[in-house]
């Protein structure tokens, strides 16, 4: 290993700010990739990494292209992937990522799905459908032209699917309220049966959201199909057209036919033989996680390593598993000392600094490098759509036809033990998705199932129950749940969406934008009730006052969690109230706080940790 001129941070609680985002990945995936990349170093050295929301951060993370505000311009697709500055003030310590790259998890473009039966899981490329391999979304097996993909490697075996971003599901911005395109539609007296750039000079594809634009003037922009946007060839930035004809044969996905190098390509018109328009299909992309882990190594003071297996080696290669080599560990520990592993039993209180958790032992990722082998020199730059960044996505309510089938719609009664995906026994669950007190019983949610814990002798534990039977609109994975003690309405949160149940009636999903929470808030960790009609809403180390009636946060009220609750983990993933105490969960553990919810003003003497324990042993009373 080599260090950089002896430079290192003079403190061990490092802060970082994600200044902007790439369009290649959903924001929550980008947040997660960076958090995991920091955690790699936090695992082996006594460093903590706290996300903050301003330029006072030690490490400012930025996506940029070409000349982007420093003296070290990027170079377009491939080549230089990212760069970082050594520790210090100002731009020193910052990490910049070249947004002309395709950022992924290292295994191809990440396409979120809608509807279907996979709860928004990303497409898995390639996937097999009816014995054929697909490397992009397809309309095969459907007669309505809506592109879909499998969310596992084999649709034929698993039957898991979702719909790809498509104008047949929704449009973005414009004035069509996010409604899908209506095809055909009339524009300037002419009929259009696909998105068009006609009438625009900026090249954005749009459509009418009614049958007649000339009459109704309602429109939206068509979502970008990143899975099918070609690079290189003679049509860079255009979309693959499926099916297309090549040498008289029809292709419904990218192919390497006709090439000796095995690279996948597609036609950008329906007939290559006549039009000769083509481009390369998106490649595997670069793992944002691994490139970031490498760059953060630089930002912490490590120079390049001469050990080819090291994360800090200057060449990019694909890798799965924990990315650090002994040389990397020696280097970071030379700078900051050896890391101490946490005690299996949690301490009575914890600091307010982040305690990064270990990354998964097998993460689909790759290590970074400054100069990988050069691929196509031209790549789409991806023009941003005009208007706001979030877009509603209403879609078809009916079940999809021939291709993948929708899951059966379940009844709304609590159905007890059917075949369960987690363990039948909640005592075997490491970390629950969400815990909440609902109708006097503590509910433990995991992977689309839940258990009820009634705090009395006899048989206190009931379940498992299928979440979708009791609350039909909910996704399988929840971040948190909360019952309003006054109205008994139940709030559920998953990602950037919220559902509110009054009995069996649901309102939602609603975007967190509607609550007054900006795009940097990627999930809600929990709510704690306050005085009448008010609550505290938590997310990633911050807390807001929340009006349960208007369902809005007070944006001026945001403060750090440790300002009101000292000694709880800053990155608690689930926060709930039970028997008039507040519980902050992190990993297998909870931190219990004596919480005064009647008073208007927080009593700092009261909001103190009074117990730390195991969720399973101490709350669920597992043996």
């Amino acid at each position: 290993f080599q260090t950089f001129k002896g430079l290192k941070w003079d403190h061990h609680n490092i802060t970082y700010w994600i200044q902007n985002y790439s369009e290649d990945l959903p924001r929550d995936m980008i947040d997660d990739a960076f958090a995991r990349a920091f955690a790699v170093w936090g695992e082996v050295a006594p460093l903590t990494f706290t996300r903050v929301y301003g330029p006072e951060a030690d490490i400012v993370i930025q996506f940029g292209v070409a000349e982007h505000g420093d003296g070290y311009p990027f170079d377009g697709k491939d080549g230089l992937l990212a760069h970082a500055f050594p520790p210090g003030a100002g731009v020193q310590g910052d990490a910049h990522f070249d947004d002309d790259e395709l950022w992924s998890l290292g295994k191809g473009v990440v396409i979120p799905t809608y509807y279907g039966n996979s709860n928004g899981a990303p497409c898995h490329f390639p996937f097999t459908f009816e014995g054929r391999s697909y490397s992009a979304c397809t309309t095969d097996g459907r007669n309505d032209g809506t592109p879909w993909c499998s969310t596992t490697a084999d649709y034929d075996k698993d039957g898991k699917f979702g719909f790809c971003p498509s104008e047949r599901l929704y449009t973005e911005h414009g004035n069509g309220e996010g409604k899908p395109c209506v095809f055909p539609f009339i524009f300037e007296g002419r009929s259009y049966s696909a998105c068009t750039t006609k009438g625009r000079s900026d090249g954005y594809r749009w459509c009418a959201t009614t049958a007649n634009y000339d009459q109704d003037k309602l429109y939206g922009f068509c979502p970008t199909r990143v899975d099918a946007t070609v690079v290189g060839g003679n049509s860079a930035g255009e979309l693959c057209v499926f099916p297309f004809v090549f040498l008289g044969k029809q292709y419904s996905s990218c192919t390497s036919d006709g090439r000796r190098d095995g690279r996948l390509w597609c036609a950008t018109t329906s007939n290559f033989d006549t039009d000769k328009k083509w481009g390369f299909c998106p490649d595997q992309g670069y793992s944002l996680f691994l490139v970031a882990a490498h760059e953060f190594g630089h930002a912490l003071g490590l120079d390049h390593s001469s050990v080819p297996e090291a994360l800090m080696y200057p060449l990019y290669s694909y890798l799965e598993g924990f990315p650090l080599n002994k040389d990397d560990i020696d280097g970071i520990q030379y700078l900051y000392g050896r890391g101490s592993k946490p005690d299996p039993r949690p301490p009575a209180t914890t600091t307010t600094e982040p305690q990064p958790t270990a990354p998964p032992t097998m993460c689909p990722t790759i290590p970074p490098t400054a100069y990988p082998t050069v691929g196509p020199t031209v790549g789409p730059t991806g023009a941003p759509s005009p208007g706001p960044t979030s877009s509603p996505s209403p879609g078809p309510t009916g079940a999809p036809s021939p291709g993948p089938t929708a899951p059966p719609t379940a009844g709304s009664s609590e159905a007890s033990t059917e075949s369960l995906s987690p363990a039948d026994n909640p005592c075997n669950v490491d970390v629950f998705d969400a815990i909440a007190e609902i109708q006097g019983a503590l509910h433990f949610f995991k992977d689309g199932w839940y258990w009820k814990f009634l705090n009395h002798r006899g048989s206190p534990l009931q379940g498992p129950f299928l979440t979708a039977r009791t609350w039909p609109a909910l996704p399988a994975t929840l971040d948190s749940a909360f019952e309003d003690p006054q109205t008994k309405r139940v709030f559920f949160f998953s990602g950037r969406q919220m559902w509110v149940y009054t009995g069996k009636t649901v309102l939602g999903p609603r975007s967190l934008d509607k609550l007054g929470l900006g795009p940097e808030v990627t999930h809600v960790s929990g709510l704690l009730p306050r005085r009448l009609g008010k609550a505290l809403l938590f997310s990633k180390g911050r807390v807001w006052r929340f009006d349960l009636k208007s369902q809005k946060v007070d944006p001026q009220s945001v403060i750090r969690v440790d300002k009101e609750f000292s000694g709880v983990p800053w990155n608690s993933h689930d926060i709930f109230q039970y028997q008039d105490k507040a519980y902050f969960c992190h990993g297998k553990f909870f931190w219990r706080v004596s919480f005064q919810n009647e008073v208007n003003k927080v009593d700092h003497e009261v909001n103190q940790v009074d117990d730390v324990g195991y969720v399973t042993y101490d709350l669920l009373q597992c043996p």
């Epitope: 001129k5 420093d70 311009p73 170079d75 230089l80 970082a84 500055f85 731009v91 200057p314 050069v374």
Partner: antibody, heavy 124, light 107 residues
Framework: EVQLLESGGGLVQPGGSLRLSCAAS???????PMWWVRQAPGKGLEWVS?????????FYADSVKGRFTISRDNSKNTLYLQMNSLRAEDTAVYYC?????????????????WGQGTLVTVSS | DIQMTQSPATLSLSPGERATLSCRAS??????LAWYQQKPGQAPRLLIY???YRATGIPARFSGSGSGTDFTLTISSLEPEDYAVYYC?????????FGQGTRLEIK
Amino acid sequence: EVQLLESGGGLVQPGGSLRLSCAASGFTFSLYPMWWVRQAPGKGLEWVSSIYPSGGATFYADSVKGRFTISRDNSKNTLYLQMNSLRAEDTAVYYCAKDRAYGDYVGWNGFDYWGQGTLVTVSS
Amino acid sequence: DIQMTQSPATLSLSPGERATLSCRASQSISSFLAWYQQKPGQAPRLLIYDASYRATGIPARFSGSGSGTDFTLTISSLEPEDYAVYYCQQRGNWPITFGQGTRLEIK
């Protein structure tokens, strides 16, 4: 020992062309950005052009954009500057220089090795 | 482009004296500044990189300081071989730019 050796300078008429070469040795040429810097007689230093290691990205001063082309052949450890449509104000000693910074760690600022320079005179 | 202004244009000092050369950037460049020495008929030689780090083989009498917009090159005790033209160069923003130079001459 690191060495940079420029060649290809000389006298040329306005509108003419020249191709400068810079032969590098003593370091891993393919890892480093390379630069051309010029100095008009009795004047200061002026950046002309630079190229990234793979050759995939090139940069030019406004005064030469569209007329000069920088390139490199990593297999020959050689840097080039093709100069077309030369003007009298292009008269200078042209130096090639090696960047201290390489790869994605951008703290090293400065050109740690320079060639001895080659004189380009544009005159009728 | 960032303008780099060096002062004074000429500095006349005797051997053994302390020389202080100044370089000012038109906007902040953090510590992305290098100093070069150039003698007649020779190529420039890197003295200081990143504002304060001596390049390989540079004597300890040369030191650099400063951050942001104001930078100084100091030669603690002038030796006969130090008389030359000194240039500063920034890389805090693109494109890189050089100062116009300070001529250090024997008094």
